[in-house]
C-alpha cells in the first residue's frame, strides 16, 4: 500500500510558544443587557500560548500579556432599521510563554 512506501517522519514536539488563535467576540463582551444585536467581525486573531511541556506537572502558561483594544461594529435594530454603532473590545495577547508548575499563579500585566 501507499502507506508502506512512505517513510514516517520523526514526531516533533509542539513546543510551548505563542501561536495565532481565533477568538470569538461574544455579544456579552459588548452588552450583557441586550441580545438584539450582532457583532462584526464575529471573530478575530489573537496570540495565545500553547504547546506541550516535558511532564504533566507543568503547563504552558503566559509570562507576559498585553491588552489590545480593538474597534468592532455593533449592529442594532432601531425603528426597524439596522444601525451600526462602534464598540471597543479589549483582547488579550500573550507575548511570552513558559512551562510553569500547575500551582503557579498567573502573571499580572
Amino acid at each position: 500500500s501507499l502507506g508502506s512506501l512512505t517513510i514516517a517522519e520523526p514526531a516533533m514536539i509542539a513546543e510551548c510558544k505563542t501561536r495565532t488563535e481565533v477568538f470569538e467576540i461574544s455579544r456579552r463582551l459588548i452588552d450583557r443587557t441586550n441580545a438584539n444585536f450582532l457583532v462584526w467581525p464575529p471573530c478575530v486573531e489573537v496570540q495565545r500560548c500553547s504547546g506541550c511541556c516535558n511532564n504533566r506537572n507543568v503547563q504552558c502558561r503566559p509570562t507576559q500579556v498585553q491588552l489590545r483594544p480593538v474597534q468592532v461594529r455593533k449592529i442594532e435594530i432601531v425603528r426597524k432599521k439596522p444601525i451600526f454603532k462602534k464598540a471597543t473590545v479589549t483582547l488579550e495577547d500573550h507575548l511570552a510563554c513558559k512551562c510553569e508548575t500547575v500551582a503557579a499563579a498567573r502573571p499580572v500585566t
Epitope: 444585536f37 450582532l38 432601531v78 425603528r79 426597524k80 432599521k81 439596522p82 444601525i83 451600526f84
Partner: antibody, heavy 123, light 110 residues
Framework: EVTLRESGPALVKPTQTLTLTCTFS??????????VGWIRQPPGKALEWLAN???????YYNPSLKNRLTISKDTSKNQAVLTITNMDPVDTATYYC???????????????WGQGTTVTVSS | DFVLTQSPDSLAVSLGERATINCERS????????VSWYQQKPGQPPKNVIY???QRPSGVPDRFSGSGSGNSATLTISSLQAEDVAVYFC??????????FGGGTKVEIK
C-alpha cells in the same frame, strides 16, 4: 417569485383623498422582517419615500407628509393600502409599492418593486 | 435630517469604459447604515443593483460594484454596456429617517 402590483384611480381632483392598494404575492406580511413601502416619483424627478408598514403592524411615515398619510395592511388578502388626503396637483406622480426586509442579519433594502401606477391631480 | 447628494447629475461614458457615481451624505457617517443603489430605465420601476453597501443581488452583472467610507458612497460600473443606460439612485437612512433617496444620476453613452 415575488410580485407587487399597485392599483388606484388614475385621476383625482384637488382636495380629494387618494387610496392606493398594493397587492403582492411570493411573500407574506406576517413573516418576521417583512415590510411594504410606498414610494412616489413626480414626472422627470427623483424618488420620494412615503411610508412603510411592517409584519408587526409598525408604521413609519415621511415626516414632511405624515399628517396626510395613512398606511394599513390586510395580511389575509396580501395587500397594503396607502391613503393620501387633501391631494394637490404637486402630488401628481407615479406611485410605487416595494417589498422591504429588515433584521439584524438582514439588509434594509427594497428588493422587489411594482410597475407603478400613475396618478394625476387635476380639476 | 440629512440629504443624499449625487454627483454628477449626468454622465456620458464610452462603451467599455468605467462609470463612477458618487453619493454624499450631508451629515453623519455613511458607514453607520447600509447604502443601496437602484437602476431605473425609462418607463420602468427602479431595480436594486447594490445593497448592503457592496452586495450584488443575484442576476446583477459583476461589472456593478459598490463601496463607501466616511460620508460618501460610490457605485462603479467597470465596463459600461448599452443596457446600463439608466438613471441611478442611491438610498440610505438613519435611526430617525426611514428612507432617503439621492437626486439621481443619468448615465448615457458617449
Amino acid at each position: 417569485e415575488v410580485t407587487l402590483r399597485e392599483s388606484g384611480p388614475a385621476l383625482v381632483k384637488p382636495t380629494q383623498t387618494l387610496t392606493l392598494t398594493c397587492t403582492f404575492s411570493g411573500f407574506s406580511l406576517s413573516t418576521f422582517g417583512m415590510g411594504v413601502g410606498w414610494i412616489r416619483q413626480p414626472p422627470g424627478k427623483a424618488l420620494e419615500w412615503l411610508a412603510n408598514i411592517w409584519w408587526d403592524d409598525d408604521k413609519y411615515y415621511n415626516p414632511s407628509l405624515k399628517n396626510r398619510l395613512t398606511i394599513s395592511k390586510d395580511t389575509s388578502k396580501n395587500q397594503a393600502v396607502l391613503t393620501i388626503t387633501n391631494m394637490d396637483p404637486v402630488d401628481t406622480a407615479t406611485y410605487y409599492c416595494a417589498r422591504i426586509s429588515t433584521g439584524i442579519s438582514s439588509y434594509y433594502v427594497m428588493d422587489a418593486w411594482g410597475q407603478g401606477t400613475t396618478v394625476t391631480v387635476s380639476s | 435630517d440629512f440629504v443624499l447628494t449625487q454627483s454628477p447629475d449626468s454622465l456620458a461614458v464610452s462603451l467599455g469604459e468605467r462609470a463612477t457615481i458618487n453619493c454624499e451624505r450631508s451629515s453623519g457617517d455613511i458607514g453607520d447604515t447600509y447604502v443601496s443603489w437602484y437602476q431605473q430605465k425609462p418607463g420602468q420601476p427602479p431595480k436594486n443593483v447594490i445593497y448592503g453597501n457592496d452586495q450584488r443581488p443575484s442576476g446583477v452583472p459583476d461589472r456593478f460594484s459598490g463601496s463607501g467610507s466616511g460620508n460618501s458612497a460610490t457605485l462603479t460600473i467597470s465596463s459600461l454596456q448599452a443596457e446600463d443606460v439608466a438613471v441611478y439612485f442611491c438610498q440610505s437612512y438613519d435611526s430617525d429617517i426611514d428612507i432617503v433617496f439621492g437626486g439621481g444620476t443619468k448615465v448615457e453613452i458617449k
